[in-house]
């Protein structure tokens, strides 16, 4: 039995997968900030987690996915206000009793030190210093991401 949050996440991910393939992104769009091979957009309004997920989708992006501790630290360095929380693309899957990223992968327990409970209707937020489990209905800011396409040097054979 999937929760409404899980259904929302799956529906949006599937609709994103169905969309026509777009040319790769070489530079970050206006208002987006580059962090390594990603473009990040920090909201300044607040929403519950599922609305935040939907908003990123309308911007042809997803809620932030964090690969490892190093990426978390670099992202947190962009947050200058200690008091602000941002949703990322990680929530608790009741059916699998585990933290699940919106791309379908599960959280490696070593990646993030989460403060708070792992339970139904829990979603993950980050601040400048920490990672928190919050009720998904809590209205806070959020971070969207777009992947930059790596520029590969083309090698042309001798003519």
């Amino acid at each position: 039995q999937k929760s409404s949050i899980e259904k929302c996440s799956v529906d949006i991910q599937q609709s994103r997968n169905k969309t026509t393939e777009r040319p790769g992104l070489l530079n970050c769009p206006i208002y987006w900030q580059q962090l390594r091979e990603k473009c990040l957009l920090f909201s300044h309004t607040v929403n519950p987690w599922n609305n935040s997920l939907a908003d990123c989708s309308t911007k042809e992006s997803s809620l932030l996915l964090i690969r490892d501790k190093d990426e978390l630290i670099h992202t947190q360095n962009l947050i200058r206000d200690k008091a602000i929380l941002f949703w990322i693309g990680l929530n608790f899957s009741l059916s699998e009793k585990n933290w699940k990223w919106i791309n379908g992968s599960f959280l490696n327990s070593n990646d993030l030190e989460i403060r708070g409970d792992a339970k139904e209707n829990s979603c993950i937020s980050i601040s400048q210093t920490s990672v928190y489990s919050e009720y998904c209905s809590t209205e806070i800011r959020w971070i969207c991401q777009k992947e930059l396409t790596p520029v590969r040097n083309k090698v042309y054979p001798d003519s």
Partner: antibody
Framework: QVQLQESGPGLVKPSETLSLTCTVS????????WTWIRQPPGKGLEWIGY???????NYNPSLKSRVTMSVETSKNQFSLKLRSVTAADTAVYYC????????????WGQGTLVTVSS | EIVLTQSPGTLSLSPGERATLSCRAS???????LAWYQQKPGQAPRLLIY???SRATGIPDRFSGSGSGTDFTLTISRLEPEAFAVYYC?????????FGQGTKVEIK
């Protein structure tokens, strides 16, 4: 209610640096894109650039070589410096709050006329 | 950069009439990131419409926006005396954001 107020000299000599400050009241500067726009007398609007509260900037390519923006979150202020000014830089300079892809330029200062003349 | 061309340059109408202002972009405006502003003499511009069709806070419903891609329209259904002003369109979907040259709505 968010309010923005520009301040700075109204007269700048050619080849010197134009310096303006915008003070934000009624809201925190710790979010949004804080923007400068100018309007030469009797003409249209030109976007100069923005600074995000964490210091990230984006400038109009036509002015990029001469522009520097900075932000002081503790004072709720952001600033514009435009180097090597000429008479063509004479304009009303506005500061504004830009909500980016959500809601664009929703709050503006009343503008300040800067004249470049010797 | 995206060039926005507004037409007509001047629109002469009487109070109570309907005004239709056009804004055409030199290339497609990303995600309909197009806004309309009203400016009166000696004042800063005021945001009317964003996202091509969403009204800003406090803007009466006689102002409406439409369009997508390269063609956008601002419609004022009934011109009140205070609506006579200059109107600018702006795209904010690509850098640098750009403004149209403006349409002046004047009393006939």
């Amino acid at each position: 209610q968010v309010q923005l107020q520009e301040s700075g000299p109204g007269l700048v000599k050619p080849s010197e640096t134009l310096s303006l400050t915008c003070t934000v009241s009624g809201g925190s500067i710790s979010s949004y894109y804080w923007t400068w726009i100018r309007q030469p007398p009797g003409k249209g609007l030109e976007w100069i650039g923005y600074i995000y509260y964490n210091g990230n900037t984006n400038y109009n390519p036509s002015l990029k070589s001469r522009v520097t923006m900075s932000v002081e979150t503790s004072k709720n202020q952001f600033s514009l410096k435009l180097r090597s000014v000429t008479a063509a830089d004479t304009a009303v300079y506005y500061c504004a709050r830009d909500g980016g892809p959500w809601v664009p330029l929703d709050y503006w200062g009343q503008g300040t006329l800067v004249t470049v003349s010797s | 950069e995206i060039v926005l061309t507004q037409s007509p340059g001047t629109l002469s109408l009487s109070p109570g009439e309907r005004a239709t202002l056009s804004c055409r972009a030199s290339q497609s405006v990303s995600s309909s990131y197009l806004a309309w502003y009203q400016q009166k003499p000696g004042q800063a511009p005021r945001l009317l419409i964003y996202g091509a069709s969403s009204r800003a806070t406090g803007i009466p419903d006689r102002f409406s926006g439409s369009g997508s891609g390269t063609d956008f329209t601002l419609t004022i259904s009934r011109l009140e005396p205070e609506a006579f002003a200059v109107y600018y369109c702006q795209q904010y979907g690509s850098s640098p954001p750009t403004f149209g040259q403006g349409t002046k709505v004047e009393i006939k």
